[in-house]
């Protein structure tokens, strides 16, 4: 169930994450799947395990194979498999399909190209970018953190983009390259009157006095990039920032794009240490865009502390 493909080039660093998650404090054991032989954790080895990460510094073609990781949590062990393939370096410029990471699409409004897998590495700027093997030069190209920004994107900007960076491990430097295709698409989105998915209109949320409570305002606005779209919470018709109660804060969720292409936003209202007076407030989830504003109202009610759910759940 938990198998992940990873690939790299010989003589470059490759770092692979266990496909099963866990907390940093949980032990992760790595094995060569074929032999069940444990992978060492000592950093003096060329291939070694470091918690959730398996490091090839540098990788060799012979390292190709399946690796097993077992996350040992306080409850159950969880197993993942990393299917690693190390390829010989190509002499020509063409990057074969099997070395390509997922294609990204950009448009005039959004032209970020993220460098794949870079978050696994200990890298420092500068991050170098190449298109079809040519180093990118000119003011239209800006390497920012772990991504490339292209200004005024045109259809000619489509192509294969390679990022190159240096991974540092205990003072030793290793090169890493990663390539992905970039396509340019016309913005063909549309905008709708906001649709609030949560909370339901006039929902009553049960809370416990003295405990923390979360309310999520979730709404969709159409397809594609939205020019103006926002979700927010109001208390008794007042913006959270103006209400002046530090226990009650709103926190922006991630922009969400669902499989049906809808552009949706979340805003979480966090109420710390719920008090009696919080039950008297009216909580409004507002979703607005160029078409207008939609409002769903929520009220809080006290959860009976001797309720069965409170005891066992």
């Amino acid at each position: 169930k938990f198998s992940k493909q990873s690939w790299g080039l010989e003589n470059e660093a490759l770092i692979v994450r266990c496909p099963r998650q866990g907390k940093p404090s949980y032990t992760v054991d790595w094995y060569y799947s074929q032999t069940n032989k444990s992978i060492p954790t000592q950093e003096r080895n060329r291939v070694f395990a470091s918690g959730q990460l398996l490091k090839f510094l540098p990788a060799e073609v012979a390292d190709s194979g399946i690796y097993t990781c077992i996350v040992r949590s306080p409850t159950f062990n969880r197993t993942g498999y990393a299917n690693v393939t190390i390829y010989k370096k190509q002499s020509d410029c063409n990057v074969p399909d099997y070395l390509m990471y997922s294609t990204v699409s950009g448009s005039e409004k959004n032209s970020k190209i993220y460098c794949p897998t870079i978050d696994l590495y200990n890298w420092t700027a500068p991050l170098e970018w190449f298109k079809n093997c040519q180093a990118l030069q000119g003011s239209r190209y800006r390497a920012h953190k772990s991504f490339l920004v292209i200004d005024n994107v045109m259809t000619e900007d489509a192509g294969d983009y390679t990022c190159k960076f240096i991974h540092n491990e205990n003072g030793a430097n290793y090169s890493v390259t990663a390539t992905r295709s970039f396509t340019v698409k016309d913005e063909q989105g549309f905008s709708l009157f906001p649709v609030i998915g949560a909370p339901a209109q006039n929902e009553i949320k049960e809370v416990e006095i003295g405990k923390n409570a979360n309310l999520t305002c979730s709404a969709c606005f159409g397809k594609g990039t939205q020019f103006l779209a926002a979700v927010l919470w109001q208390l008794n018709g007042t913006k959270i920032t103006d209400f002046g109660e530090p226990r009650i804060q709103q926190e922006e969720g991630q922009n969400q794009s669902f499989s049906n292409g809808l552009a949706c936003l979340d805003m979480v209202l966090r109420i710390a240490d719920v008090k009696e007076e919080d039950l008297l407030l009216q909580y409004d989830c507002l979703a607005l865009n160029l078409h207008g504003l939609r409002r769903h109202t929520v009220r809080l009610s006290r959860k009976n502390p001797i309720d069965h759910h409170s005891i066992y759940c």
């Epitope: 998650q21 907390k23 077992i70 949590s73 306080p74 409850t75 159950f76 062990n77 066992y312």
Partner: antibody, heavy 121, light 107 residues
Framework: EVQLVQSGAEVKKPGESLKISCKGS????????IGWVRQMPGKGLEWMGI????????RFSPSFQGQVTISADKSITTAYLQWSSLKASDTAMYYC??????????????WGQGTTVTVSS | DIQMTQSPSSLSASVGDRVTITCQAS??????LNWYQQKPGKAPKLLIY???NLETGVPSRFSGSGSGTDFTFTISSLQPEDIATYYC?????????FGGGTKVEIK
């Protein structure tokens, strides 16, 4: 087909003993944890505990520790939940559920059909 | 014990609506969270494991997200057969604990 088949409904009096069963088939019974979940009438799910039939290792929720016994007979691929002295508050639906192997786990992926236990004088 | 707080406790939505259920853990549980569907008179059924992985055979309209303490379960387009109670469950620590459940009804 992987399945867990539970014993039939029981009607008992307070103070009586009871042992309900859960028979596993279609998979390696000794390699998977089997657990029990209680659902009182009109209420939610409560995890009671688990057993690893391969070595009879058990884990209990503190709420059920000492109240029930969980056992297994690997020769007949069956897990058991038993009470030595039933109370009216034990009236509930009891489900057995498979909890993954000693090396891998991804939720309670196979459930029995449930056994209704009614305790009434 | 880790407390799992699920909300709302019940909701009513129309066929085709997007339905969202939230689950909050009283402490960090990484992504060790599962979602179950229980139809009236039936045993629960695993839908999502490890917060976001769809169990084999489960329709793609069901999805899950989140990590740490805050988790979301979504039905992208509610169908009549989705009438059920949905439970979240953590398995980061013993005892395993369930949320109080969310009863989903059709308007």
């Amino acid at each position: 087909e992987v399945q867990l088949v539970q014993s039939g409904a029981e009607v008992k009096k307070p103070g009586e003993s009871l042992k309900i069963s859960c028979k596993g088939s279609g998979y390696s019974f000794t390699n998977y944890w089997i657990g029990w979940v209680r659902q009182m009438p009109g209420k939610g799910l409560e995890w009671m505990g688990i057993i690893y039939p391969g070595n009879s290792d058990t884990r209990f929720s503190p709420s059920f520790q000492g109240q029930v016994t969980i056992s297994a007979d690997k020769s007949i691929t069956t897990a058991y939940l038993q009470w030595s002295s039933l109370k009216a508050s034990d009236t509930a639906m009891y489900y057995c559920a498979r909890h993954g192997t000693s090396s891998d786990y991804y939720g309670l992926d196979v459930w029995g059909q449930g056994t209704t236990v009614t305790v009434s004088s | 014990d880790i407390q799992m707080t699920q909300s709302p406790s019940s909701l009513s939505a129309s066929v085709g609506d997007r339905v969202t259920i939230t689950c909050q853990a009283s402490q960090d549980i990484s992504n060790y969270l599962n979602w179950y569907q229980q139809k009236p008179g039936k045993a629960p059924k695993l839908l999502i494991y490890d917060a976001s992985n769809l169990e084999t055979g489960v329709p793609s309209r069901f999805s899950g997200s989140g990590s740490g303490t805050d988790f979301t379960f979504t039905i992208s387009s509610l169908q009549p057969e989705d009438i059920a109670t949905y439970y979240c469950q953590q398995d980061d620590n013993f005892p395993l604990t369930f949320g109080g459940g969310t009863k989903v009804e059709i308007k």
